[in-house]
């Protein structure tokens, strides 16, 4: 498999058959698949060097792995997008052997003197062809030469099979399955041959191709493949329930932010709640996690403005649940990204010198910001798309707080909507879905560059649009939701999570 190890070295060779038998639409589809693969790999913070070859009678090398920009995913994607099927129109035979020889030439080194670290570089060849080579001879001989060059299958104790993966995608109206199978790697419990119809569900294909065991701790990563559970798609999501004898129980959500901490809303708990009465589950697992302590933001005080006629005051409505035992990360349990951390800098593919302010400008610009939250409906987690009103609609969004029960007599809305809040909901630019009571404490998320970054914690709403846990279809325009802006509580997060290796900026 493609081992995505941010600390490893990898060359990926994209080889695309542009011969007559492929056809323009299949060529375009294959290109799209490769663009998606480049993006998927880049989302892991891995920076492989790419080689890019198209071929028919002759190969054309568009990107060499030795080029400075070959590890710049955006630049490689641009080169790929600029390739036309017509480029091989005049000489449209199929010489797959020559194309693979072009790959071999990129792999090999001058004077047979291997560079330092050559034996630690993994090589991945992704060949898109119909297998109908009609000139140049059998391409399998070049695969053998490549294996020989990389010292694969020669050493009994160290066969190095994981240093070469050859994936073949059958494209075109007629595919020679025998030829394609012959070229692809054969490894136990791995799939290296894919068909055209597989490409309709690329996430499923990538799931078969990628080994992410070295990057399970990466924040904000998800798997969207069809066989995935809700928690493959939202692996940070935590369910919280507080049992109060004779008072029933309170349900909330939270987000895994590190191996020991779940971030949620402070209002989910009262000072009387004991740790043993708080149940937290992650990854869709039945068992509850043992809790060491709940840490409230020191400025949170729900009764802080009772004298001023404000029955409930949600400023600084955040809490961290510290777990007794370390979480074991996997595909259904992994952290979400937090603002102003090194992990988020890498997730957004920003330079290492990026400041907290620059992250804020990237994630929360002064405009309507597309975001999402996760809600549970009929035992299923679903993503709800909303817009954070952070531009010209911000004022009107915040003013609608006056329609919340108990806030109707508030003269100055900034008394309840402090600078700590982000506002969503309403009907412009689109009709936003609203949060339900049980969504409280869950993350408000910005999805960028295939990664998920938490920017807020769901706190309170103006209208209860979820009578009997069913979302009403028709809701008033003033149905707004308010979320604690994580950029505004960073000093507290940084202090409490200082031992969690998150690299706060």
């Amino acid at each position: 498999k493609i081992v995505l190890d941010p600390s490893g070295s990898m060359n990926i060779y994209l080889v695309l058959d542009g011969s007559d038998s492929i056809g323009a639409s299949n060529f375009t589809g294959a290109k799209k698949c490769l663009v998606n693969l480049i993006e998927k790999v880049a989302s892991y913070g891995v920076k492989p060097r790419y080689g890019l070859v198209t071929y028919a009678t002759y190969p054309k090398i568009w990107v060499k792995v030795s080029e400075a920009d070959s590890s710049n995913a955006d630049w490689v994607t641009k080169q790929l997008n600029e390739i036309n099927y017509e480029d091989h129109k005049l000489k449209s035979g199929t010489n797959t052997k020559k194309a693979l020889q072009a790959v071999y030439s990129m792999m090999s080194w001058p004077d047979d003197v291997p560079p330092e670290g050559w034996n630690r570089t993994r090589h991945v060849i992704i060949l898109m062809t119909d297998g109908l080579h009609n000139m140049g001879g059998d391409p399998i001989t070049v695969i053998d030469e490549i294996r020989d060059l990389l010292y694969i299958g020669k050493d009994r104790k160290n066969p190095r099979e994981d240093y070469l993966d050859v994936y073949v995608f059958g494209v075109g109206p007629l595919v020679n399955q025998v030829n394609i199978n012959a070229l692809a790697s054969k490894k136990d419990n791995e799939q290296h041959v894919f068909k055209v119809k597989d490409m309709e569900n690329l996430e499923d294909v990538f799931y078969q191709m990628i080994d992410e065991s070295q990057s399970l701790s990466l924040c904000g990563m998800v798997w969207e493949h069809r066989k995935g559970t809700d928690y493959h798609k939202q692996p940070w999501q935590a369910k919280i329930s507080v049992i109060r004898p004779s008072k029933g129980h309170e349900s909330c959500m939270g987000a895994v932010v590190s191996e020991y901490f779940v971030l949620t809303a402070a209002h989910c708990f009262t000072v009387d709640d004991k740790e043993h009465s708080i149940k937290v589950s992650v990854g869709g697992e039945k068992r509850d996690l043992e809790i060491e302590v709940v840490l409230f933001h020191p400025n949170y005080n729900i009764n802080g403005k009772k004298e001023a006629g404000i029955p409930e005051f949600y400023d600084y409505d955040v809490a961290l649940i510290k777990l007794k035992n370390k979480l074991k990360y996997g595909q259904t349990i992994r952290p979400i990204c937090l603002p102003c951390t090194e992990g988020t800098t890498r997730a957004l593919r920003l330079p290492p010198t990026t400041t907290c302010q620059q992250q804020k400008e990237e994630l929360l610009p002064a405009q309507d910001i597309k975001a999402l939250f996760v809600s549970e409906e009929e035992k299923k987690l679903t993503r709800k798309e909303v817009y954070i009103k952070n531009g010209d609609k911000k004022g009107s969004c915040e003013r609608d707080a006056q329609y919340a029960p108990g806030y109707d007599k508030v003269k100055d809305i900034s008394e309840v909507v402090t600078p700590r809040f982000l506002c969503t909901g309403g009907v412009s630019p689109y009709a936003d879905p609203n949060t339900c009571r049980g969504d409280s404490g869950g993350p408000l998320i910005v999805h960028k560059r295939s990664r998920f970054i938490q920017v807020g914690v769901i706190s309170w709403g103006v209208v209860d649009v979820c009578k009997n846990q069913k979302r009403q279809k028709q809701v008033p325009a003033h149905a707004r939701d308010f979320h604690i802006n994580l950029f505004q509580v960073l000093p507290w997060l940084k202090e409490k999570l200082q031992d969690e290796d998150l690299g706060f900026l």
């Epitope: 047979d112 291997p114 034996n119 010292y151 020669k154 050493d155 009994r156 104790k157 160290n158 190095r160």
Partner: antibody
């Protein structure tokens, strides 16, 4: 045909140095481990060390008895293995063999004819 | 390091007889399903010759009367019916762990 030929043996005084060579033909030299083995008169075989193949960067490994005194190196362009022996002792007197160590099964499948080193005053 | 002990030190047999030579390792020489134990034959004035690799695999060109067996720490070289040219010294050698080590040898002599 695989062939290994040792050279450089001879008479040397205690404390002296000697460099043995092992020229090879008939195989891709850099793809193999190459070992040195010696045999003192009337005694058994003693493995001295090897140079690993290219996937391991040709790094050497030594037996404790010669570590620090003997150095194994190779010149892949000349398909030649070397054994540099320093601070020689009388007990280093032996026939010195080079052998190809096949990584396909980790056994010494081809041997040279040996070269005699005599350490004596 | 792994110490290899061969037994017997000397074995006196006649042509046509069956020879059984033993080699015991101070610790297992198995790795990932393979036993890294090899057997060599050496005749006077000659370089050693590989007979058996990985405990039981006969090197090409070696007669079928030579066979190897064993795993872990106990290994055996068997010569089913001795020929006159088989009388020599036999060494076991492990290649599982660095440093490689040889046994002290078993001398097979004509009775």
């Amino acid at each position: 045909e695989v062939q290994l030929v040792e050279s450089g043996g001879g008479l040397v005084q205690p404390g002296g140095s000697l460099r043995l060579s092992c020229g090879t033909t008939g195989f891709t030299f850099r793809d193999y481990y190459m070992s040195w083995v010696r045999q003192a008169p009337g005694k058994g075989l003693e493995w001295l060390g090897f140079s690993r193949h290219r996937a391991y960067g040709y790094t050497p490994e030594y037996a404790a008895s010669v570590k620090g005194r003997f150095t194994i190196s190779r010149d892949n362009s000349k398909n030649t293995l070397y054994l540099q022996m320093n601070s020689l002792k009388t007990e280093d007197t032996a026939v010195y063999y080079c052998a190809r160590d096949n990584p396909g099964y980790y056994a010494m499948d081809y041997w040279g004819q040996g070269t005699l080193v005599t350490v004596s005053s | 390091e792994i110490v290899l002990t061969q037994s017997p030190a000397t074995l006196s047999l006649s042509p046509g007889e069956r020879a059984t030579l033993g080699c015991k390792a101070s610790q297992s020489v198995d790795y990932d399903g393979d036993s890294y134990m090899n057997w060599y034959q050496q005749k006077p004035g000659q370089a050693p010759r590989l007979l058996i690799y990985a405990a039981s695999n006969r090197e090409s060109g070696i007669p079928a009367r030579f066979s190897g067996s064993g795993s872990g720490t106990d290994f055996t070289l068997t010569i089913s019916s001795l020929e006159p040219e088989d009388f020599a010294v036999y060494y076991c050698q492990q290649s599982n762990a660095d440093p490689y080590t040889f046994g002290q040898g078993t001398k097979l002599e004509i009775k």
